[in-house]
Amino acid sequence: YDFTNCDFEKIKAAYLSTISKDLITYMSGTKSTEFNNTVSCSNRPHCLTEIQSLTFNPTAGCASLAKEMFAMKTKAALAIWCPGYSETQINATQAMKKRRKRKVTTNKCLEQVSQLQGLWRRFNRPLLKQQ
């Protein structure tokens, strides 16, 4: 999906008002210095591409974050503010949804959500030069 046509300011507002709090809740009990940020993004569409991938694509050691509250809210925000997102992304994840196992918070998942926090922070500061 091409995120260039999204309403970035509205997505930012949704992140600041609710998604960010759910990410913090998920990470509660974890030190902010525990994980190094290894995933980066260069502009807002790129950031959303990385956020989409890290939130909804299963990875080794972290089968699925998609049932977490922050993920459902992310999906809702993208569905609302990115025209065409629902048809291309959500229809494609319906089969995965049926196979999903129970939620398990592994260290790998915590690391992944830490990366997500970094991507979202970068998304919110698009004018900063890449480190």
Partner: antibody, heavy 120, light 111 residues
């Protein structure tokens, strides 16, 4: 049973406000959009706005901006639509309609409708 | 945002097919594959018949079909039955600030 149940008919004076409720049951209220659509006597359908409780987002049709307020109480699975500065042209049946999960613009479940009459 | 344009009436005999058109612009029908159709019987709430241009919700007979070409969407009812007599409304998404604009409605009469 999956349904939306709306509050009863209202008669209001011009210039006043009306608040219509819509109670959901049988589905996860927060995940869907709750849209409000009205239909004046003998006329077509007109979209007023939507609330997506999961993310607390409300979007209003430009025509009603500043005059309509849509809210939701997730603890009671109830959505509300308040329309202010009523005029005779606001006389209509007001429907709440569920927008499909993540496809909030398709209305797959409707309330029974609430007739609002604006008359002096 | 202007309403979508539908013919005020359409008719057909039982068993026949009838097609109802719905014309918009590149800002609504032409710009998105987010067209839906609703059936409304007198005194009742509307019912979703078609969504995403051509998909049918479960329980809707396959006699109802939808399509789109450019800025015009169409609803076809084949094998007309008496219970199909109703008002039909098309709807289109028109951007992140307008989730639905409706057509003026078409009264379908089964002769």
């Amino acid at each position: 049973q999956v349904q939306l149940v709306q509050s009863g008919a209202e008669v209001k004076k011009p210039g006043s406000s009306v608040k219509v409720s819509c109670k959901a049951s049988g589905f996860t209220f927060g995940s869907y959009g709750i849209n409000w659509v009205r239909q004046a006597p003998g006329q077509g359908l007109e979209w007023l706005g939507v609330i997506v409780p999961l993310v607390g987002v409300t979007i209003y049709a430009e025509k009603f901006q500043g005059r309509v307020t849509i809210t939701a109480d997730t603890s009671t699975s109830t959505a509300y639509m308040e329309l202010s500065s009523l005029r005779s042209e606001d006389t209509a049946v007001y429907y709440c309609a569920r927008g499909q999960e993540y496809f909030y613009w398709y209305f797959d479940l409707w309330g029974q409708g609430t007739l609002v009459t604006v008359s002096s | 945002q202007s309403a979508l344009t539908q013919p005020p009436s359409a008719s057909g005999s039982p068993g026949q097919s009838v097609t109802i058109s719905c014309t918009g612009t590149t800002s609504d029908i032409g710009g998105y594959n987010r067209v839906s159709w609703y059936q409304q019987h007198p005194g009742k709430a509307p019912k979703l018949m078609i969504y995403e241009v051509s998909k049918r919700p479960s329980g809707v007979p396959d006699r109802f079909s939808g399509s789109k070409s450019g800025n015009t969407a169409s609803l076809t009812v084949s094998g007309l039955q008496a219970e199909d007599e109703a008002d039909y409304y098309c709807s289109s998404y028109a951007g992140t600030d307008t989730f639905a604009i409706f057509g003026g409605g078409t009264k379908l009469t089964v002769l």
